[in-house]
Amino acid sequence: AILGRSETQECLFFNANWEKDRTNQTGVEPCYGDKDKRRHCFATWKNISGSIEIVKQGCWLDDINCYDRTDCVEKKDSPEVYFCCCEGNMCNEKFSYFPEMEVTQPTSNPVTPKPPYYN
């Protein structure tokens, strides 16, 4: 393993597809993949009138957008479906939305507010 890289071997699993079929498929998913590919965890959810509705959580495979991210944070501004990914066992247990604002002229040192976490 590369020094400093957080290997992902398992992720929190949830799949609304299975839930609606009353099979209660939630748990811990082991992540499998080719030796030369990186493995990640992800979460995807909707915000319906301020209520968080998880769609899926589980393993995600070799995506450069997930490399070296220890926290699961969605940075897109107001997506229809929120998505985040991260590296490290069960790193998708908590996920957050923290849109990157386009600041044209900062007048002072920017302060990064702590993003809201959901779990």
Epitope: F13, N24, Q25, E29, Y32, Q57, G58, L61, V81
Partner: antibody, heavy 120, light 107 residues
Framework: QVQLVQSGAEVKKPGSSVKVSCKAS????????ISWVRQAPGQGLEWMGG????????NYAQKFQGRVTITADESTSTAYMELSSLRSEDTAVYYC?????????????WGQGTMVTVSS | EIVMTQSPSSLSASVGDTVTITCRAS??????LAWYQQKPGKAPRLLIY???SLHSGVPSRFSGSGSGTHFTLTISSLQPEDFATYFC?????????FGPGTKLEIK
């Protein structure tokens, strides 16, 4: 590397049942997501349902609900798909397939297919 | 049920060409879109998963893009072995559904 080997071709009468097996070689059978997909001659692909063996419960397409049963035997690393009340339109190649992840990112390993012919 | 449509249903191209196949979903499927290649008498083969991730062992001339309801598969510098039928599939919501296929023929 997982490999999936399916049982041989079947010829069945309308109204009867067929049970197709799918034996997996390689590790971690219990924690794989196994799906079944069928393809009628010259037609497209149709997802029937899937199972994660360690959970034991299957998820079915509404179209087949009540007529299909998907099971798995962890001791033999074998998944099964049983389809009952067969009709001529069930004539198809039936594939068992491994998914990349439990949340169904993509069907990456396919069995060789089992041809099921329903004819009187 | 999410209905998947593909266009064109068939196309002719020559070795070395670049071709693009489009897949549309009747509802948003986020990134849960895969592309498969199938040759006569053979099982389908996974090419692209999660809309744009290239599956292991698939040549880099295959690429996928899109999210939500509109997706594309592009094959650049067509090779003789690429002439086949291509299917898209959504796995965002059960029942998982496939497009009707696009048959890529040699010109």
């Amino acid at each position: 590397q997982v490999q999936l080997v399916q049982s041989g071709a079947e010829v069945k009468k309308p109204g009867s049942s067929v049970k197709v097996s799918c034996k997996a070689s390689g590790r971690h059978f219990g924690s794989l997501q196994i799906s079944w997909v069928r393809q009628a001659p010259g037609q497209g692909l149709e997802w029937m349902g899937g199972i994660i063996p360690i959970y034991g419960t299957a998820n079915y397409a509404q179209k087949f609900q009540g007529r299909v049963t998907i099971t798995a035997d962890e001791s033999t690393s074998t998944a099964y798909m049983e389809l009952s009340s067969l009709r001529s339109e069930d004539t198809a190649v039936y594939y068992c397939v491994k998914d990349l992840t439990w949340t169904n990112l993509g069907l990456d390993i396919w069995g060789q297919g089992t041809m099921v012919t329903v004819s009187s | 049920e999410i209905v998947m449509t593909q266009s064109p249903s068939s196309l002719s191209a020559s070795v070395g060409d670049t071709v693009t196949i489009t897949c549309r979903a009747s509802q948003g499927v986020s990134r849960w879109l895969a592309w498969y290649q199938q040759k006569p008498g053979k099982a389908p083969r996974l090419l692209i998963y999660a809309a744009s991730s290239l599956h292991s062992g698939v040549p880099s001339r295959f690429s996928g893009s899109g999210s939500g309801t509109h997706f594309t598969l592009t094959i650049s510098s067509l090779q003789p072995e690429d002439f086949a039928t291509y299917f898209c599939q959504q796995s965002y919501s059960t029942p998982f559904t496939f497009g009707p296929g696009t048959k890529l023929e040699i010109k």
